[in-house]
């Protein structure tokens, strides 16, 4: 029941993952890995943060957002078909078995030969906010309405329903704020 995101060969892919630090600068270690989340940490780690900074990264993988504010969304530069697969975002909240694990499926499509259509700006009407709740059973999807001024009170990936990376970029460009605490 991984949430699915898409990008085209040659584009940058965007895999959203967010949390709200308990206090500004009070960061939680996060890792991103290629492959589903294992029991501890991430498998095949591509990027890692600690309580202060990004302390490990590999080429083409970076955090474009402000990770000090909890935006730990992963950008993969210039994707190829080999980048398809499941990625794990793990937020390592201190405590007893407190980690939050999110498996995100990246699907890479061959580059379009024809010019891309005009990007949909009024995407809140076309794509109402969806929250995909993941557990051991099938994904349960519910509509939460349009995007602005949403306040989620749980750690979650942002825009789980936005399957296309460009739509996720639109979300960031729109200035919609999601507060997760």
């Amino acid at each position: 029941s991984e949430v699915e995101y898409r990008a085209e060969v040659g584009q940058n892919a965007y895999l959203p993952c967010f949390y709200t630090p308990a206090a500004p600068g009070n960061l939680v270690p996060v890792c991103w890995g290629k492959g589903a989340c294992p029991v501890f940490e991430c498998g095949n780690v591509v990027l890692r943060t600690d309580e202060r900074d990004v302390n490990y990264w590999t080429s083409r993988y970076w955090l474009n957002g402000d990770f000090r504010k909890g935006d730990v969304s992963l950008t993969i530069e210039n994707v190829t078909l080999a980048d398809s697969g499941i990625y794990c975002c793990r937020i390592q909240i201190p405590g007893i078995m407190n980690d939050e694990k999110f498996n995100l499926k990246l699907v890479i499509k061959p580059a379009k030969v024809t010019p891309a259509p005009t990007r949909q700006r009024d995407f809140t009407a076309a794509f109402p906010r969806m929250l995909t709740t993941r557990g051991h059973g099938p994904a349960e999807t519910q509509t939460l309405g349009s995007l602005p001024d949403i306040n989620l009170t749980q750690i979650s990936t942002l825009a789980n329903e936005l399957r296309d990376s460009r739509l996720a970029n639109d979300l960031r460009d729109s200035g919609a704020t999601i507060r997760i605490g």
């Epitope: 890995g33 492959g35 589903a36 294992p38 029991v39 501890f40 940490e41 991430c42 498998g43 095949n44 780690v45 591509v46 890692r48 490990y56 590999t58 390592q92 909240i93 201190p94 405590g95 007893i96 078995m97 407190n98 980690d99």
Partner: antibody, heavy 123, light 107 residues
């Protein structure tokens, strides 16, 4: 040379407590997840608990988390397992193990193990 | 919990034989599988991790394969020091779980 040496095992009555220790040497202890695995006499391996590098994240077998507490002291290169309200079924050899780790991997399998310490719970 | 089932439980073989031990997971664990070897009175030794990667210092006669729910450990030509008990362990789901073990004995 990597070494893990467990101590603190012994005979204890049901309902009693024990604190196991694992002294680590030959590696940078604070860089590694650490784990306790147990093995009842003549039986297979059972994961008990694990702890992350700085001790802020802990993981337990559900049935044990109310009675067992894993902790570490990186300054002393030591791992601990506090066991309370012990039962006969806790009788086992308890192994301390190091989670295999480098920056691009995950510490979900164990590359070095101690020799084990026997805990016997009996009246 | 993810159940790990090894087969056979015990196996008799001779030096030079090729043997295969299998491990089945009750659900998809991708390639998150490890194999250990344990000799009587000793602690386990890491052989293979991530289903097929040989641990440092492990002889090349050992090999691991599989993904999803079906895995195997093969010893291409048994040596006297290979007679031991072998355990698989999954590290996809909490709790970490081990197979019940396969005891490899001399025929």
């Amino acid at each position: 040379e990597v070494q893990l040496v467990e101590s603190g095992g012994g005979l204890v009555k049901p309902g009693g407590s024990l604190r196991l220790s694992c002294a680590a040497s030959g590696f940078t202890f604070s860089d590694y997840y650490m784990t306790w695995v147990r093995q009842a006499p003549g039986k297979g391996l059972e994961w008990v608990a694990s702890i992350n590098y700085d001790g802020r994240n802990t993981y337990y077998l559900d049935s044990l988390k109310s009675r067992f507490t894993i902790s570490r002291d990186n300054a002393k290169n030591s791992l601990y397992l506090q066991m309370n309200s012990l039962r006969a079924e806790d009788t086992a050899v308890y192994y301390c193990a190091r989670g295999y780790y480098y920056y691009g991997s995950s510490p979900n399998y164990f590359d070095y193990w101690g020799q084990g310490t026997l805990v016997t719970v009996s009246s | 919990d993810i159940q790990m089932t090894q087969s056979p439980s015990s196996l008799s073989a001779s030096v030079g034989d090729r043997v295969t031990i299998t491990c089945r997971a009750s659900e998809n664990i991708y390639s998150y599988l490890t194999w250990y070897q344990q000799k009587p009175g000793k602690s386990p030794k890491l052989l293979v991790y991530n289903a097929k990667t040989l641990a440092e210092g492990v002889p090349s006669r050992f090999s691991g394969s599989g993904s999803g729910t079906q895995f195997s450990l093969t010893i291409s030509s048994l040596q006297p020091e290979d007679f031991a008990t072998y355990y698989c362990q999954q590290h996809y789901g909490t709790p970490l779980t081990f197979g019940q073990g396969t005891k490899l004995e001399i025929k």
